[in-house]
Amino acid sequence: SRLRQEDFPPRIVEHPSDVIVSKGEPTTLNCKAEGRPTPTIEWYKDGERVETDKDDPRSHRMLLPSGSLFFLRIVHGRRSKPDEGSYVCVARNYLGEAVSRNASLEVALLRDDFRQNPTDVVVAAGEPAILECQPPRGHPEPTIYWKKDKVRIDDKEERISIRGGKLMISNTRKSDAGMYTCVGTNMVGERDSDPAELTVFERPTFLRRPINQVVLEEEAVEFRCQVQGDPQPTVRWKKDDADLPRGRYDIKDDYTLRIKKTMSTDEGTYMCIAENRVGKMEASATLTVRAPPQFVVRPRDQIVAQGRTVTFPCETKGNPQPAVFWQKEGSQNLLFPNQPQQPNSRCSVSPTGDLTITNIQRSDAGYYICQALTVAGSILAKAQLEVTDVLTDRPPPIILQGPANQTLAVDGTALLKCKATGDPLPVISWLKEGFTFPGRDPRATIQEQGTLQIKNLRISDTGTYTCVATSSSGETSWSAVLDVTESGATISKNYDLSDLPGPPSKPQVTDVTKNSVTLSWQPGTPGTLPASAYIIEAFSQSVSNSWQTVANHVKTTLYTVRGLRPNTIYLFMVRAINPQGLSDPSPMSDPVRTQDISPPAQGVDHRQVQKELGDVLVRLHNPVVLTPTTVQVTWTVDRQPQFIQGYRVMYRQTSGLQATSSWQNLDAKVPTERSAVLVNLKKGVTYEIKVRPYFNEFQGMDSESKTVRTTEEAPSA
């Protein structure tokens, strides 16, 4: 063919543009060419010719008259992607060809499955909340937005920001709680993530915090702790960073911690811990327990000879530690611990509170008051100093060696020993079953030393024999049982003093309370026989005019004698015991006065109590033997005072091995009670009985004593 002058080769006048299109959607790649003759257009994808409807009428690609490539629908699968690629159109005529610029056809894609679904988030109000989301794979890369409870979130609110798939709420509120959905979107459409729940909890806060408290010991105390939060916080208490000890504390429904009766050990820091899923708060308060001053060692009354030194102990405790000072009653002068001693002053107070007076003068006699003072209260204790030349309180006679229980044969001879001493010298007399003996019986004589001799013994001589040593200072008795049988020994065994243990040392007073005295002593001098036990005897002018056995079978050389009267001077002696009998008595202790009764419970006038109790007159009736081991005691009362709690029935054995043993008590604890039954008594033994009214630690006057002898067998009808 011949070249025409007006012919020219193809030239592309409209190039195809890059396109991104959704799968299944139609699209067109444009291409326009000029040339003469009019060029034919073909399309190539990735270097391969593209089949169109011109090749196969069923093709989804159509070549338009303009030369553009029209796709009825973009075909694009998970694997097969026949339409995606790089396209060029080629225009041809006989003069040549022109190739367009490359145009990429990319298929927009938005998968269903999110690369990262948001997950449930729990935050505390005020904290930031972050919900994370990675949208499904897609092309173009999907953008995201968020919906709360199906409503699109406006990220223009300053608390909310959406950056790179993250929804950030900077300062969460309760109202932010809800269901959040992440929406991934591109030209294909939208995909909703699985919803995620944002729960906004409130960390615990205190509506009421515990406050520091100062209380007195025994007072109740409450620490309040009111909290709020969501979920409702659990509340627990700690003391000094440890769990609360069991039993002492009561935690109420509103989490108030209550201590019913505070003790000094309750002092410390109490922490209320409120905790829930999103937080933990602690609030603490201190408890200071003020313990009012108390005496650890009270000063006791002392009787001291002139020229000697005396020390009154006064040891106290409390919280805070009490300040202690001394004062002599009637004097304005106060004595403090660690005070520089005044010239010519004979008084000083030790750091622990003991008052020492040296070179005692008669003028020092009187009452000394120890006072202990703190913010929690004050206490005082009085102690009397009696100054003597010599002891004016002369004790009753002392029986050095008394009669022993013995079993002798009919027609034998009995020797019942009784050796006594005292100032003035005592006179010795004898009783049989409480009646004067020997009377006119020629078989019985009292020998020079006081020993009772009975010859030609008869069965009828069996009984309890009592030696009584009497002087102007009182009387002392000692009983023994003589049992005359057909088969006994013919004569009394005459114990030699060398068979007996040596007398113990002078007892020392180590402690005194209102009802007790603690004594200590040393065993007999070396070379004497050892003691298996000890007995303690006591004398008080105001209690009786004789020595009383206040303790039997004492196994140690330290013993507390109890059941003594308050504010009463006592003397004590100790005897050693071995199988052969009793030693001579120890030297007498120094006189010791028991403490005065402590002030009564609040609201009771102790002077009134003491006065009323002092006016009570108890009349004891003759005791009745019910069985060989039980006795009924009855009494009447002249007038029933307001202050009476009950009656103390006091009884002791006055015959047998434990003659003049210490008093045993049976309390009738009902004020209206007028009788009591003594049980577990010994058969065939004489008992002395008396009754004393009481109110708390106050005691009234004893009734007159009555004696009763239990039977050997049940009394006959």
Epitope: D46, R49, D56, V75, G77, R79, S80, P82, D83
Partner: antibody, heavy 118, light 105 residues
Framework: QVQLVQSGAEVKKPGASVKVSCKAS????????MHWVRQAPGQGLEWMGW????????EFPQKFQGRVTMTRDTSISTAYMDLSRLRSDDTAVYYC???????????WGQGTMVTVSS | DIQMTQSPSSLSASVGDRVTITCRAS??????LNWYQQKPGKAPKLLIY???SLQSGVPSRFSGSGSGTDFTLTISSLQPEDFATYYC???????FGGGTKVEIK
């Protein structure tokens, strides 16, 4: 017209290998994945794997890994499936199938009967 | 691997009957499910793709439904040419169901 034409029937001894061909026409060969499926006598369809003709990438289920090889020759628009170490239970009709852009096998070959017998 | 379970394995029906075949996936496959028809001695033929889309040239009496794990092929009115074996196939991992043979009653 789009079609897949497979090679003829084969009889093989156990332990031998067989290579079946599948020639595509009427479409752009490199635009669609090619799959192989077999069917033992009286049994169901069993997918054996695919090849991407554009780049030669392949994927097989665990069962056939190590025994099957899939290749292609783009110049003649033909895909091949090679099965080695034949056993009697490999006796089946072997089909090639084109995966459309809708993720389905829209065009199938006529099938090639492979008999493994001693 | 995602397993496909077809039921029933065979059924007898008459021309004009409504026939339903079910296919269950061992885990969710969204809508990636296809249905094929195969007649004896012939290659399988695509009926339904993407669970419910009818392949061009396939009669409208065939329909597909379902998503996730449970899918159904329904033939609204069985025709004589419809007696064949039907297979489901998941297009994520490409495995086939065991097949359902539809026979003349």
């Amino acid at each position: 017209q789009v079609q897949l034409v497979q090679s003829g029937a084969e009889v093989k001894k156990p332990g031998a290998s067989v290579k079946v061909s599948c020639k595509a026409s009427g479409y752009t060969f490199t635009g669609y994945y090619m799959h192989w499926v077999r069917q033992a006598p009286g049994q169901g369809l069993e997918w054996m794997g695919w090849i991407n003709p554009k780049n030669g990438d392949t994927e097989f289920p665990q069962k056939f890994q190590g025994r099957v090889t899939m290749t292609r020759d783009t110049s003649i628009s033909t895909a091949y499936m090679d099965l080695s170490r034949l056993r009697s239970d490999d006796t089946a009709v072997y089909y090639c199938a084109r995966e459309s852009g809708d993720d389905a096998f829209d065009i199938w070959g006529q099938g090639t009967m492979v008999t493994v017998s001693s | 691997d995602i397993q496909m379970t077809q039921s029933p394995s065979s059924l007898s029906a008459s021309v004009g009957d409504r026939v339903t075949i079910t296919c269950r996936a061992s885990q969710s496959i969204s809508s990636y499910l296809n249905w094929y028809q195969q007649k004896p001695g012939k290659a399988p033929k695509l009926l339904i793709y993407a669970a419910s889309s009818l392949q061009s040239g396939v009669p409208s009496r065939f329909s597909g439904s379902g998503s996730g794990t449970d899918f159904t092929l329904t033939i609204s009115s069985l025709q004589p040419e419809d007696f064949a074996t039907y297979y489901c196939q998941q297009s994520v991992g490409l495995f086939f169901g065991g097949g359902t043979k539809v026979e003349i009653k």
